[in-house]
């Protein structure tokens, strides 16, 4: 059929949650192209109706939820306008059992369920939540051992859950859990994560390199929308949290209340030496009491500034 | 059930370079830490490097000049390799991964080791 | 470096002796953790953690300490016991193991 067969991934799903593939292969994916997925080589393709419990939304394959008999291989085919490209997509489903301790080991998951922190050090797991964006997902909630995770040591932020000074108690299994919201209807995700701990520094201490910002100013309107992306180098084995701050303060912490001042959701792109991290903080409606605070893009030892101010008054 | 297994030749030259692969079974070696260790005869261990999930290398500064550990996660193999040998590096070799009760460090899983001598 | 020294180097016992390996380090470490080796085999890890014992490890095996002092015990040591045990620290850069004690029957 003249399809390039790109690769196979692998992914142990869990019975009776939502679940979501992306069909991305940069740079195929960047172009022109249009996707359609199949499964197990049919020529029939997923339904695009959203009513549907399985279908395609844009470049996405969406199960909602996902079901056992949806166990199988599943094809997204890429096509350019003169090029076609497949990929193969395993998927492998389970009943899920986090809370059985009669059950000792989770199955082979994927390497995004298997996370570790640091000894000593401040560090963090992540919620994975690959979903498109018809998807709301709800605050994240965290467990562990199936307890819901309280205490100064924990802090949520975004899809990150903050351990401070980790220490030994800290392995073992956790949960993040998100209520998702798809056509007015809602599902419950539950990722089970496996958490090890390691002493080993691991990034060989190595200190986080921020390109931006650069202790600089913003001239920015009262009243606008901003955005800034704070840009950060750091080694693939890091450890580092990366956050904005503000009066030593999580900005989401110190505009808890009105939600004015957020920050968003880090994003990462690999290369082969390092990893260039982007975690953007976002100005709803700039205020008065904004202009000459700095606002501070952390990333382990490494710390940088923006400064809002007004514009210069035009006398033109 | 995890299994490491060494591979190598078993005997090498001065000045040559040893190279040895370990064949993980069992674990992805896209989690976790994959670590190497020599057994002098007669002497004690010593560590000799590991390469993480995310292909981080550590090497032991004793070694770092002549040492390079990597890996092919399409096979679930790690490699070792050791430049310039000398009769000093005759030795037992493992390879060794934790994990053991969710302790990377605790180093649970081993190879059986491979002799490998350096001799003319 | 942190530099691992057990003590003793070699020790002859007897069957049901109370024994205690020593292990001092040149610098604090957080944890410390022993492999037992026999002959021809490869080491097992023993104790992890400073004071747990890995799978199948006999409970008259103990371990504890903090700081740069760390102990194996064995409270009456049995035949299969006799083999070298090594300590290991993974705080601090290069992982060093101690030189090994072997244990030996008197």
């Known amino acids: 059929d003249g399809c390039n067969d790109i690769f196979m991934k692998n992914e142990m799903l869990s019975a009776s949650q939502p679940f979501a593939f992306n069909c991305t292969f940069p740079p195929i994916t960047s172009g022109e192209v249009s996707v359609t997925w199949y499964k197990n080589s049919s020529k029939i393709p997923v339904s695009k109706i959203i009513q549907s419990r399985i279908h395609q939304d844009e470049t996405w394959i969406l199960f909602l939820p996902m079901e056992w008999g949806d166990s199988g291989v599943y094809q997204c085919v890429i096509k350019g306008r003169d090029s076609c490209h497949r990929i193969h997509v395993n998927l492998t489903v389970f009943e899920k059992q986090w809370c059985d301790t009669s059950v000792k080991g989770l199955p082979n998951l994927s390497d995004e369920y298997k996370q570790i922190l640091h000894l000593g050090k401040d560090d963090s797991l992540t919620c994975h939540l690959h979903f498109p964006k018809s998807c709301i997902l709800g605050p994240i909630k965290w467990y562990k051992d199936c307890n819901e995770i309280t205490g100064e040591r924990f802090t949520v932020l975004e899809t990150r859950l903050l351990v401070s000074n980790v220490s030994a108690e800290d392995r073992g299994n956790y949960a993040c859990q998100v209520i998702l919201t798809h056509s007015g209807k809602q599902y419950e995700v539950l990722n089970g994560i496996t958490v090890s701990i390691t002493e080993r520094a691991g990034y060989g201490g190595s200190v986080p390199k921020i390109i931006y910002p650069k202790n600089n100013s913003i001239e920015v309107q009262l009243g606008t929308t901003l955005i800034v992306d704070c840009n950060i180098t750091d080694t693939k084995d890091n450890t580092n949290l990366r956050c904005w701050r503000v009066n030593n303060t999580l900005v989401d912490d110190y505009y808890n209340e009105s939600k004015r001042i957020r920050e968003g959701v880090e994003t990462h792109a690999s290369f082969r030496e390092y990893n260039l991290y982007t975690v953007n903080i976002t100005f709803l409606e700039v205020k008065m009491e904004d202009y000459g605070l700095p606002f501070m893009c952390h990333a382990g030892v490494s710390a940088a500034y923006i400064m809002l101010q007004l514009p210069a008054p035009d006398f033109r | 059930q995890v299994q490491l297994q060494e591979s190598g030749p078993g005997l090498v030259k001065p000045s040559q370079t040893l190279s040895l692969t370990c064949t993980v079974s069992g674990a992805s070696i896209t989690s976790g830490y994959w670590n190497w260790i020599r057994n002098h005869p007669g002497k004690g261990l010593e560590y000799i490097g590991y390469i993480s999930y995310s292909g981080y290398t550590y090497y032991n500064p004793s070694l770092k000049s002549r040492v390079t550990i990597s890996r092919d996660t399409s096979k679930n193999q790690f490699s070792l390799k050791l430049s310039s040998v000398t009769a000093a590096d005759t030795a037992v070799y493992y390879c060794?991964?934790?994990?053991?009760?969710?302790?990377?460090?605790?180093?649970?899983?081993w190879g059986q080791g491979t002799l490998v001598t350096v001799s003319s | 470096d942190i530099q691992m020294t057990q003590s003793p180097s070699s020790l002859s016992a007897s069957v049901g002796d109370r024994v205690t390996i020593t292990c001092r380090a040149s610098?604090?470490?957080?944890?410390m953790y022993w492999y037992q080796q026999k002959p021809g085999k490869a080491p097992k890890l023993w104790i992890y953690?400073?004071?747990n014992l890995a799978s199948g490890v006999p409970s008259r095996f103990s371990g504890s300490g903090s700081g740069t002092s760390y102990t194996l015990t064995i409270s009456s040591l049995q035949p299969e016991d006799f083999a070298t045990y090594y300590c290991?620290?993974?705080?601090?850069?290069?992982?060093?193991f101690g030189q090994g004690t072997k244990l030996e029957i008197k």
């Open positions: 290991q620290q993974f705080t601090t850069s290069p992982y060093t």
């Open positions: 953690l400073t004071s």
């Open positions: 610098s604090n470490v957080r944890y």
């Open positions: 060794a991964t934790g994990g053991y009760d969710y302790v990377e460090d605790a180093l649970y899983y």
